[in-house]
């Protein structure tokens, strides 16, 4: 390399993944500027494990590793990590060749290239590199799915992560499928979890300065099948006044396909109950969950007649659920006059209507 | 074994309906989740929507927003797409897709995944 | 809606070959990418998730890498029945988009 030469990666984009792990060797007294992802969104700069400023003689700035003046402490391993995460753009090793001025040829080229023969930089317990998303302990997810536990960390030296379930070590061993590790993401992923997967999960992370931990709590959600689940509070009681417009709603929650029926209670021969103690009912809809507008009731221009209780009947595969309101209906002269009408009634009951 | 067969399709006239079935067999979808996607001839793939069976939410394209409705009957393991108001530019094969959810805990939300395909089932739009 | 770029959009190689197709997306979708390989009149077929991990049953020689709005998928060593079209997808925003596709052909 000649004297004026800067080492320079260039195009500054983020690198192919031919251009990982290079090795340069640089002139003592020489200026680097190594390039790492688009310059609003560069990477950030690491040496040893440990983050650059980006202010000094050695700087991590706009995705660019500039060295002033390269000195002999400048060899060693340099690592560029993308933005929000810890994967590797550029894993590159700094190793000095003949000095600009003056060289120690006793001098083991190779020390510059092993941390362990290193004391120049400062070391550092691991840390979170993002603890605000470590705070969200207990996690529910349904069975079938796949989980992905991540804890990124730094130090220096780089720290080595290992996982715990319910304070044991975890290698995923004795579990179907077993368990998928990504140590340069940090991250454990279970795939198709069951409820034997519920429990603690422990990412300890750790380095020769120190060690941190943190807990995630799973929970394995599994799904019992159930008949329609009505939403409480609907249909609702109303009071219309003779000639307008009526509106019952009714909000259906069902995996197996529903079938909805709206129901009006009917008086036969002065009795509102059969002798099987049924109620007298008279279908006004009928349809599938999926027709439009099967959840709503509409009653147009209602009458005197139309007054009395209503009730949304849902039934799946499983079993039948049904709630029921009342309709008041007012004459047009007194439309100030409010029926205490009886609450809607919440049922849980099979119903049988003829 | 995971199987998906589409049904449904066909020619249809500009602005009719048409609905399609996804038959599904060596799973349940009880908290997993049903996609549908389609391909225009000689096109690359379109997410069209999804049915996530754990909560019955379904999520749509904005190009098939208010016209596409998906829906599913658990206890015979079949999701539907419901098609009405169709246009020329919904011509294409029309896959169902098993789809299940990895749960980044860290950054708490879900990744959609689609493992399992059918055939598919071409729809033409014409008159 | 997050754009999906592929680059290149079709490829000639040859078995044995090494092949890279990037995926770039218009912005940050952290992990969130897989990978799908489809064979004319075929549907399509998962290949990898989350960016980097393979799918049960997909063969070795296919791998995935990136993170934000950069990613890869490479085959290590293209076999005869690789020659396909591969779809990448991300779905961290809402909608799911897909790139528009890179063609692998034989040269």
């Known amino acids: 390399l000649e004297a004026s030469e800067e080492v320079e990666l260039e195009p500054c984009l983020a690198p192919s993944l031919e251009q990982q792990e290079q090795e340069l060797t640089v002139a003592l007294g020489q200026p680097v500027r190594l390039c790492c992802g688009r310059a609003e969104r560069g990477g950030h700069w690491y040496k040893e494990g440990s983050r650059l400023a980006p202010a000094g003689r050695v700087r991590g700035w706009r995705g660019r590793l500039e060295i002033a003046s390269f000195l002999p402490e400048d060899a060693g391993r340099y690592l560029c990590l993308a933005r929000g995460s810890m994967i590797v753009l550029q894993n590159l090793t700094l190793i000095t060749g003949d000095s600009l001025t003056s060289s120690n040829d006793d001098e083991d080229p190779k020390s510059h290239r092993d941390p362990s023969n290193r004391h120049s930089y400062p070391q550092q317990a691991p840390y979170w590199t993002h603890p605000q998303r470590m705070e969200k302990k207990l996690h529910a997810v349904p069975a079938g799915n796949t989980v992905k536990f991540r804890c990124p960390a730094a130090g220096n030296p780089t720290p080595t992560i290992r996982w715990l379930k319910d304070g044991q070590a975890f290698h995923g061993e004795n579990r179907i499928g077993g368990i998928r590790l990504r140590h340069q993401h940090w991250s454990l992923v279970m795939e198709s979890v069951v409820p034997s997967d519920r429990g603690t999960y422990t990412c300890l992370v750790e380095n020769a300065v120190g060690s941190i931990r943190y807990n995630y709590l799973l929970d394995v959600l599994e799904r019992s099948p159930h008949r329609p689940i009505l939403q409480a509070g609907l249909p609702a009681n109303t009071t219309a006044v003779v000639g307008s417009d009526v509106e019952l709603l009714c909000k259906v929650y069902s995996d197996a396909q529903p079938h909805i029926q709206w129901l009006k209670h009917i008086v036969i021969n002065g009795s509102s109950f059969g002798a099987d103690g049924f109620p007298y009912v008279q279908v006004l809809k009928t349809a599938d969950i999926n027709s439009s507008e099967v959840e709503v009731l509409y009653l147009r221009n209602v009458s005197a007649e139309d007054a009395g209780e209503y009730t949304c009947l849902a039934g799946n595969s499983i079993g039948l659920s049904y709630q029921s309101a009342w309709l008041t209906v007012l004459p047009e002269e007194d439309p100030t006059w409010t029926a205490a009408a009886p609450e809607a009634r919440y049922t849980d009951h099979h119903h049988h209507h003829h | 074994e995971v199987q998906l067969v589409e049904s449904g399709g066909g020619l249809v006239q500009p602005g009719g309906s048409l609905r399609l079935s996804c038959a599904a067999s060596?799973?349940?979808?009880?908290?997993?989740?049903i996609s549908w996607v389609r391909q225009a001839p000689g096109k690359g793939l379109e997410w069209v929507g999804r049915y996530w069976a754990w909560d019955g939410s379904t999520n749509y394209a904005d190009s098939v927003k208010g016209r596409f409705t998906i829906s599913a009957d658990t206890s015979k393991n079949t999701a539907y797409l419901q098609m009405n108001s169709l246009r020329a530019e919904d011509t294409a094969v029309y896959y169902c897709?098993?789809?299940?959810?990895?749960?980044?805990?860290?950054?708490?939300?879900?990744?959609?995944?689609?493992?399992?395909w059918g055939q598919g089932t071409l729809v033409t739009v014409s008159s | 809606d997050i754009q999906m770029t592929q680059s290149p959009s079709s490829l000639s190689a040859s078995v044995g070959d090494r092949v890279t197709i990037t995926c770039r997306a218009s912005q940050d979708v952290d992990t969130s990418l897989a990978w799908y390989k489809q064979k004319p009149g075929k549907a399509p077929k998962l290949l990898i998730y989350s960016a980097s991990f393979l799918y049960s049953g997909v063969p070795s020689r296919f791998s995935g890498s990136g993170s934000g709005t950069d990613f890869t998928l490479t085959i290590s060593s293209l076999q005869p029945e690789d020659f396909a079209t591969y779809y990448c997808q991300q779905s961290t925003g809402h909608p799911q988009t897909f790139g528009q596709g890179t063609k692998v052909e034989i040269k």
């Open positions: 897709a098993r789809t299940y959810g990895i749960y980044d805990l860290y950054v708490d939300y879900t990744e959609y995944v689609m493992d399992y």
């Open positions: 060596g799973f349940t979808f009880t908290s997993t989740g």
